[in-house]
Interface confidence: low
């Protein structure tokens, strides 16, 4: 009674179970009554992670400069490279396809996150006694300037865009 | 000073190519993307394409087959143009990238060079 | 390549006051736009990329923000000098890459 069902690792083929493939080998000639499968490793810059049937191994992808990308692992006949972005960059997809620059927060608005070469700048706004004044990557919100420990007092109102600005206490003569 | 300066614009009549040149100076752009865009007189910007730091070129749709950009020298690059129309009148910029990658940022423009199409 | 929509084509506004242009990205471009400002006869100036960072040397009283598909570019404190028409350049760079640029808006100031 000829198989419906191969164990794992091989595969259904003319009314018989052949062996797959290994990782980084692909498929040259299925298996006969009289022979095995017949597998030859990938050439240079290609690759297949699985066990397979595959008559072609893919190319390992191309980490492109032009995009803002750079190799992070290079690949092997197992696994496909893996890219990431130039410093300053990060990747706009899980794949990384592309490199997008990382977000300023801008004034208003301060650093919760600082990116990463996979996750863009989160940014947060200044809560109240915080401000950001700059358009910037790294800059957190700053707390508001304590007039009082500088036996100072509030001139000018601090908003999430500026400080306070301090001035001396009108003394009575 | 860091200057871009095109040439090579004029009146031609269509059918005619015309091959523009950038010319960088105070400083070599092999390090930067070079692009090339160009304004109607009268009309918006039009963006034709780019040159990166290692020589690979993107066109705007609209211009793939009409346009060639190519890096001469270190301080030069190219836009070659195809049997121009009446269309193609406009001033022609090149600009540098803030990088060497493709971006949207183009720091430093050149005053453009006007090609006039006219029978 | 990416089709940007850019809205009012054209705005007129008193001295002091605040002026918002914006684009629109047919598609993603993530934070890939650039603000331009031209003034008649002269080439583009960069004013800011990378949607909210400002060029080197740009007045404060212009910020960009947006991510995505939504772009806006405000100008406040307006000055006789900010008369202008502004564009916007977004890329996507993904399988198809392309720069592309808005259609202008004409900054009049009164």
């Known amino acids: 009674e000829p198989p419906t069902a191969c164990r794992e690792k091989q595969y259904l083929i003319n009314s018989q179970c052949c062996s797959l493939c290994q990782p980084g080998q692909k498929l040259v000639s299925d298996c006969t009554e009289f022979t095995e499968t017949e597998c030859l490793p990938c050439g240079e810059s290609e690759f297949l992670d699985t066990w397979n049937r595959e008559t072609h191994c893919h190319q390992h992808k191309y980490c492109d400069p032009n995009l803002g990308l750079r190799v992070q692992q290079k690949g092997t006949s197992e696994t496909d490279t893996i890219c990431t972005c130039e410093e300053g960059w990060h990747c706009t997809s899980e794949a990384c396809e592309s490199c997008v620059l990382h977000r300023s927060c801008s004034p208003g608005f301060g650093v919760k996150q600082i990116a990463t070469g996979v996750s863009d700048t989160i940014c947060e706004p200044c809560p109240v006694g915080f401000f950001s004044n700059v358009s910037s990557a790294f800059e957190k919100c700053h707390p508001w300037t304590s007039c009082e420990t500088k036996d100072l007092v509030v001139q000018q109102a601090g908003t999430n865009k500026t400080d306070v600005v301090c001035g001396p206490q009108d003394r009575l003569r | 000073q860091e200057q871009l300066k095109e040439s090579g614009g004029g009146l031609v009549t269509p059918g005619t190519a015309l091959t523009l040149t950038c010319t960088a100076s105070g400083s070599d752009i092999s390090s930067y993307a070079m692009n090339w865009v160009r304004q109607a007189p009268g009309k918006g910007l039009e963006y034709i394409g780019v040159?990166?730091?290692?020589?690979?070129i993107y066109y705007a749709n609209w211009a793939t087959g009409r346009f060639t950009i190519s890096k001469a020298s270190s301080t030069t690059v190219d836009l070659k143009t195809t049997r121009l129309t009446t269309e193609d009148t406009a001033t022609y910029f090149c600009?540098?990238?803030?990088?060497?990658?493709?971006?949207?940022?183009?720091?430093?423009w050149g005053p453009g060079t006007l090609v006039t199409v006219s029978s | 390549d990416v089709v940007m929509t850019q809205t009012p084509p054209s705005v007129s506004e008193p001295v002091g006051g605040t002026v918002t242009i914006k684009c629109q990205a047919s598609q993603n471009i993530y934070n890939n736009l650039a603000w331009y400002q031209q003034t008649p006869g002269q080439p583009p100036k960069l004013l800011g990329y990378?949607?909210?960072n400002l060029a080197s040397g740009v007045s404060s009283r212009f910020s960009g923000s947006g991510y995505g598909t939504e772009f806006t570019l405000t100008i406040s404190d307006l000055e006789c000098a900010d008369a202008a028409t502004y564009y916007c350049?977004?890329?996507?760079?993904?399988?198809?890459?392309?720069?592309?640029f808005g259609g202008g808006t004409e900054v009049v100031v009164k």
């Open positions: 990378a949607a909210s």
């Open positions: 350049l977004g890329g996507y760079y993904g399988n198809n890459v392309g720069n592309t």
């Open positions: 040159i990166t730091s290692s020589g690979t």
């Open positions: 600009a540098r990238g803030i990088t060497g990658a493709v971006t949207t940022g183009l720091s430093l």
